[in-house]
């Protein structure tokens, strides 16, 4: 099999990507400058460490988590890195334009890089549903549309619902999941005869996917606490996330065994279920008052994740054409919803505790916020899906789905790679 990119893509991708990069450089030149007020170098280092954690999560964690396909592991890791690098650049500019631009130039701080990395993470979650079925040129489009949609969603939610950075970023789970699923729904679905083996997982890539899951597991507390304002909030977020992911690991492994007739543990279930607790407590991680509650949520999330992994792939494969091992989309959609429900429960407690007669109104606002996130995700996802179907992108033929050799140069081209 030829390892060359199709000629049309060879012409299209470098031109498209490099033109875009040149445009980004020009935008940075004219519209941005660094924050000149950094006086405390120790504080700078501490602040950078949080951003570093997020980058590790994105590049290594999500990069390797999506690399479990037998013949698509290289592309999964490298395309993730490409999307992260591009997404961060565009997200910094977009966030700056939306929040600061009327004042003149966009000031770049470590916090804006933190926000941008989290915005780019959204794309890496979504893309799990379409990796293997699209080329890099199409992924560039997906990055631009999704980061733009998420940035605008966050601004609208912040302005209408008066939410802080943490709250409006925590819609990322639901947003990314529904965005990815709606893009996948638009793409050609059936795998032609003879290529079914390509979307199967293999031992070594599955091990690297487990490595990705481990990195995400280790750094999830950093993700959930990155945008919180005070030390007490961050401390609570770190503790609660840690308890939740710890319990979801135990639940994932034992639940996976329980779900199998012979009591065997499924790699695919474990990859995503270990993260379940972190997603479920994301929205309210700083508000949960005691460890046992976070642990219960981790348990519930782990069970939902394993249950979803057992029963949903068949449906997702038929309707959306998502392979069995790409379970992040529906997993995050369920767990993100669970997280939002938990927050609404806390909101009701808050309103009751304040003796406030406006419970219905407050709950309605929260449901409105969630609905807005889902609607924008679905609409922008469908728009992206339609764009990706345009002939100009020279999408891989269905027979070349999940195949590294379409995109990469392998000196030895070993059969069965």
């Amino acid at each position: 099999m030829s390892s060359k990119y199709p000629r049309s893509v060879r012409r299209c991708l470098p031109l498209w990507a490099l033109t875009l990069e040149a445009a980004l450089i020009l935008l940075f030149y004219f519209f941005t400058h660094y924050d000149a007020s950094l006086e405390d170098q120790k504080g700078l280092v501490a602040s950078y460490q949080v951003g570093q954690d997020l980058t590790v999560m994105a590049a290594i964690g999500l990069g390797f988590l999506t690399s479990s396909f037998r013949r698509h592991s290289w592309s999964s890791v490298a395309f993730n890195l490409f999307m992260l690098a591009l997404g961060v650049q565009w997200a910094i500019l977009l966030d700056g334009f939306l929040s600061q631009f009327p004042s003149g130039k966009v000031v770049i701080t470590l916090f804006s890089i933190r926000l941008a990395t989290m915005s780019a993470l959204s794309v890496l979650i979504s893309v799990d549903a379409v990796l293997g079925k699209v080329n890099l040129a199409q992924l560039v489009v997906m990055v631009l549309v999704e980061v733009t949609a998420l940035g605008n969603l966050r601004m609208v939610i912040s302005n209408i619902f008066n939410t802080d950075y943490h709250m409006n970023m925590m819609h990322i789970y639901v947003f990314a999941a529904y965005f990815g699923l709606s893009v996948a729904w638009c793409l050609p679905k059936p795998l032609p005869e003879g290529t079914e083996d390509k979307d199967q997982t293999a031992t070594i890539p599955s091990l690297s996917a487990m490595l990705g899951a481990l990195f995400l597991w280790m750094f999830w507390p950093s993700f959930n606490s990155a945008l919180l304002r005070s030390p007490i909030e961050r401390k609570n977020a770190v503790f609660n996330t840690y308890y939740a992911v710890a319990v979801s690991v135990v639940t994932a492994i034992s639940g996976s065994s329980l779900a199998h007739p012979q009591g065997k543990i499924s790699k695919t279930y474990v990859h995503s279920a270990v993260l379940a607790g972190g997603v479920a407590v994301g929205t309210s991680c700083h508000l949960i008052p005691s460890p046992w509650l976070a642990m219960v949520l981790g348990l519930v999330a782990g069970l939902i994740s394993v249950g979803g992994a057992k029963y949903l792939p068949g449906c997702c494969n038929r309707v959306l054409g998502i392979p069995h091992s790409s379970i992040m989309g529906y997993n995050f959609s369920l767990l993100g919803l669970l997280g939002e429900i938990i927050y609404i429960v806390l909101l009701v407690l808050d309103t009751v505790g304040a003796g406030n007669g406006m419970i219905g109104f407050q709950v309605l606002l929260s449901i409105g916020e969630l609905s807005l996130a889902i609607v924008i995700a679905l609409m922008s996802g469908l728009l992206t899906g339609l764009l990706l179907n345009l002939k100009i992108w020279k999408a891989p033929h269905e027979a070349k789905y999940f195949d590294d050799q379409v995109f990469w140069k392998f000196p030895h081209l070993a059969v069965g790679f």
Epitope: L38, D40, G43, L44, A46, S47, V50, T109, L110, F111, R114, S158, N162, D164, Y165, M167, R229, S230, P231, I232, E233, N236, H286, L287, P289, Y343, L346, L347, L349, D350, T351, G353, A354, N356, M358, F361, Q362
Partner: antibody, heavy 125, light 108 residues
Framework: QVQLVESGGGVVQPGRSLRLSCAAS????????MHWVRQAPGKGLEWVAV????????DYADSVKGRFTISRDNSKNTLHLQMNSLRAEDTAVYYC??????????????????WGQGTLVTVSS | DIQLTQSPSSLSASVGDRVTITCRAS??????LNWYQQNPGKAPKLLIY???NLQSGVPSRFSGSGSGTDFTLTISSLQPEDFATYYC??????????FGGGTKVEIK
């Protein structure tokens, strides 16, 4: 006891710059968010800017965005406000204040529990 | 931004009187409202946080109530040192804290 002492105020011409400082003592400065709030002569309080405890994020009132920069040096227990392109309407007493976060069910409550005595900035030609 | 409207803007009262100041928010802010007292030429001082919690060191004659959009600061028995200006402040929208216009309590 908690003390916040502002300095750097004075008379300045429109379009010029001024840098205010706030020296903090009597508490662990690096664990608290800090604010600048101003009060024009005979008027009410107007929030100006906040900086998070670790300096990682800053938010500003629309009226000063792009002109004022809040910063802090946790190693010196000092808060700063760099004011550029000053206008006559920036004339006010500027207070620095310490932020406390208190847990609610659905979000945290923030309030300013200690304030400095203020420093007067007069923008006049 | 959330707007806070205080009423009255000024009032005259005598020592020993019961005084009530109201603060109305342009939208529901649950109980995320604080009250401050400012004496002439002095820095503001925190009285009440979270609509009804008394800050330590503040006399118990001060109390706060309300939730949603309507809030009240009550001084049960006015003392000479209470003649000052009172401000409400919301922290529901944390990206931009806002203050009410103030209520000046004067001696009748």
């Amino acid at each position: 006891q908690v003390q916040l002492v502002e300095s750097g105020g004075g008379v300045v011409q429109p379009g010029r710059s001024l840098r205010l400082s706030c020296a903090a003592s009597g508490f662990t400065f690096r664990t608290y968010g800090m604010h600048w709030v101003r009060q024009a002569p005979g008027k009410g309080l107007e929030w100006v800017a906040v900086i998070w405890y670790d300096g990682s994020n800053k938010d500003y009132a629309d009226s000063v965005k792009g002109r004022f920069t809040i910063s802090r040096d946790n190693s010196k227990n000092t808060l700063h406000l760099q004011m550029n392109s000053l206008r006559a309407e920036d004339t006010a007493v500027y207070y620095c204040a310490r932020e406390i976060a208190s847990r609610g069910y659905s979000r945290y409550l923030y309030y300013l529990d200690f304030w400095g005595q203020g420093t007067l900035v007069t923008v006049s030609s | 931004d959330i707007q806070l409207t205080q009423s009255p803007s000024s009032l005259s009262a005598s020592v020993g009187d019961r005084v009530t100041i109201t603060c109305r928010a342009s939208q529901s802010i649950s109980s995320y409202l604080n009250w401050y007292q400012q004496n002439p030429g002095k820095a503001p001082k925190l009285l009440i946080y979270g609509a009804s919690n008394l800050q330590s060191g503040v006399p118990s004659r001060f109390s706060g109530s309300g939730s949603g959009t309507d809030f009240t600061l009550t001084i049960s028995s006015l003392q000479p040192e209470d003649f000052a200006t009172y401000y409400c402040q919301q922290s529901y929208s944390t990206l931009a804290l806002t203050f009410g216009g103030g209520t000046k309590v004067e001696i009748k």
